[in-house]
Interface confidence: low
């Protein structure tokens, strides 16, 4: 009863020309030990012969004969539990289905594993949190659906083309559940990082470039403001006029409201980027700043100290 065969392995394995593929695999045949194992490439069932046709990459029969010339293909398993395979190096034309033809005393089974070999190293994939806010620590993740014992790789993080100083943690998985290499970087972005390009670069053991993925940082932040005053020294006499201008150097998302504050108190009906004070009086001396808000929160400019002297 072929329903007794239970296999566990990654569904699809990914590699590129010249690299290798390590296929973690376990199986169970309840009626006893394996007597014959054949690894096919793209097997097809032949109804006339009741056998499978296809390239035989590896063959192991009960009398121990291993006629395979494919030294690059290794069966690292055993007769009752392990069906792990290694192909090193792996070639473009290895893409397709690997068929594990297993036979025990009374049962037969064909297990299929998909192999996807690309011509060049495929890029990793950067995963960002759904939202990034300034000064809040986030974890950047770079994931590559590849890991192989015979082909060491590394993932490096770059910001605007320059290696990032923060320490990244790299982990690999070579299990029946999943095969991947992952790099995680904890990072506290500043507002000035908004719009900057982050790269995760795949390199070989010698640091040679293989591929990369890039993302543009979208750092949510309160409006960043500059205040300008005329006259520039903010010292005037009673009766003079003063103009203060608020400039938004950056805001993400877009700003929604503008207000002016004097000594921390909002000035009524002053909701434009220019504050005009005409014929100032002594009691208008004080600390002025502009406040611009967006969905993240309010941003304030530096304070300007206005000194109104007697005429």
């Amino acid at each position: 009863d072929s329903s007794k065969w239970v296999f566990e392995h990654p569904e699809t394995l990914y590699a590129w020309e010249g690299a290798c593929v390590w296929i973690p695999c376990t199986y169970r045949a309840l009626d006893g030990d394996l007597e014959s194992f054949i690894l096919f490439h793209n097997p097809e069932y032949n109804k006339n012969t009741s056998k499978f046709d296809g390239t035989r990459l590896y063959e192991s029969t009960k009398d121990g004969k291993v006629p395979s010339e494919q030294k690059r293909v290794q069966f690292l398993g055993d007769k009752n539990k392990n069906c792990t395979l290694s192909i090193h190096p792996v070639h473009l034309n290895d893409s397709g289905q690997l068929g594990l033809r297993m036979e025990s005393k009374t049962e037969k089974w064909m297990e299929r594993i998909h192999l996807n070999v690309s011509e060049r190293p495929f890029p990793p994939h950067i995963q960002l949190p759904p939202e990034i806010q300034e000064s809040q620590e986030v974890t950047l993740t770079c994931l590559l659906n590849f890991s192989c014992y015979g082909y060491p790789i590394q993932l490096q993080w770059l910001l605007e083309g320059v290696p990032m100083r923060q320490a990244a943690v790299t982990s690999t998985s070579l299990t029946i559940k999943s095969v991947f290499t992952r790099s995680e970087l904890k990072f506290s972005p500043q507002w000035s990082h908004h719009g900057k390009i982050v790269t995760c670069q795949l390199q070989d053991a010698d640091g040679k470039f293989l591929s990369n993925d890039t993302v543009q940082l979208n750092v949510k932040h309160t409006p960043k403001l500059e205040i300008k005053v005329t006259p520039s020294d903010a010292i005037v006499r009673e009766g003079d006029s003063v103009t203060m201008t608020c400039e938004v150097s950056s805001s993400n998302p877009e700003y929604t409201t503008v207000s002016w504050l004097k000594d921390g108190t909002s000035l009524k009906k002053q909701n434009t980027f220019t504050l005009n004070l005409r014929e100032v009086t002594k009691d208008q001396s004080g600390k002025y700043c502009c406040q611009v808000s967006n969905d993240v929160g309010p941003g304030r400019s530096e304070e300007v100290f206005l000194q109104v002297q007697y005429a």
Partner: antibody, heavy 120, light 112 residues
Framework: EVQLVESGGGLVQPGGSLRLSCAAS????????MNWVRQAPGKGLEWVGR????????NYSGKFKGRFTISADTSKNTAYLQMNSLRAEDTAVYYC?????????????WGQGTLVTVSS | DIQMTQSPSSLSASVGDRVTITCRSS???????????LEWYQQKPGKAPKLLIY???NRFSGVPSRFSGSGSGTDFTLTISSLQPEDFATYYC?????????FGQGTKVEIK
Amino acid sequence: EVQLVESGGGLVQPGGSLRLSCAASGYEFSRSWMNWVRQAPGKGLEWVGRIYPGDGDTNYSGKFKGRFTISADTSKNTAYLQMNSLRAEDTAVYYCARDGSSWDWYFDVWGQGTLVTVSS
Amino acid sequence: DIQMTQSPSSLSASVGDRVTITCRSSQSIVHSSGNTFLEWYQQKPGKAPKLLIYKVSNRFSGVPSRFSGSGSGTDFTLTISSLQPEDFATYYCFQGSQFPYTFGQGTKVEIK
């Protein structure tokens, strides 16, 4: 264009047998799992079983094992559902559905369905 | 067998409404490969079902972007962001991770 066309439905007496056919065209028949799904009148969908035509490998839902048999003929690009010892509760529309990818498992193409009525 | 329970069984909604259908499995439907083979199908009266979403959240080709899927483990959701006249139908979740494969009982989306 990928197409599945079922046939063989009709009226059958309780205890009788019926063989449904699902003719496939527009793709490599032997390399995709073919599923049978049924739907009793006014009820939901129920998975019956599947076959991989390339090697004849099958899986069934437990309640259909023994009475229903799925087979395939790659020379005719046709899958079959042989139903024996039919009961009134087997009255349903029977659909064949292709697994679009042996690696993603989803039913991307369905036949139009064929109605089986079990009644005396 | 894994039971797939959908809620609600039926709902009435208007064109433009946001509709959410949930599907709960009686046990985890994570496949040994690490994938979760959870699909959503749409069926109209007298017609064969049509695939909308596969592997929890992947939209099948040609399916409008107003359909989205989410979830993990045992809890899954199909969302229609803005219901259109052609969306009134019955929706089924389906697990293809463990044998026997099983469908939910269906959710009928009717015009209010």
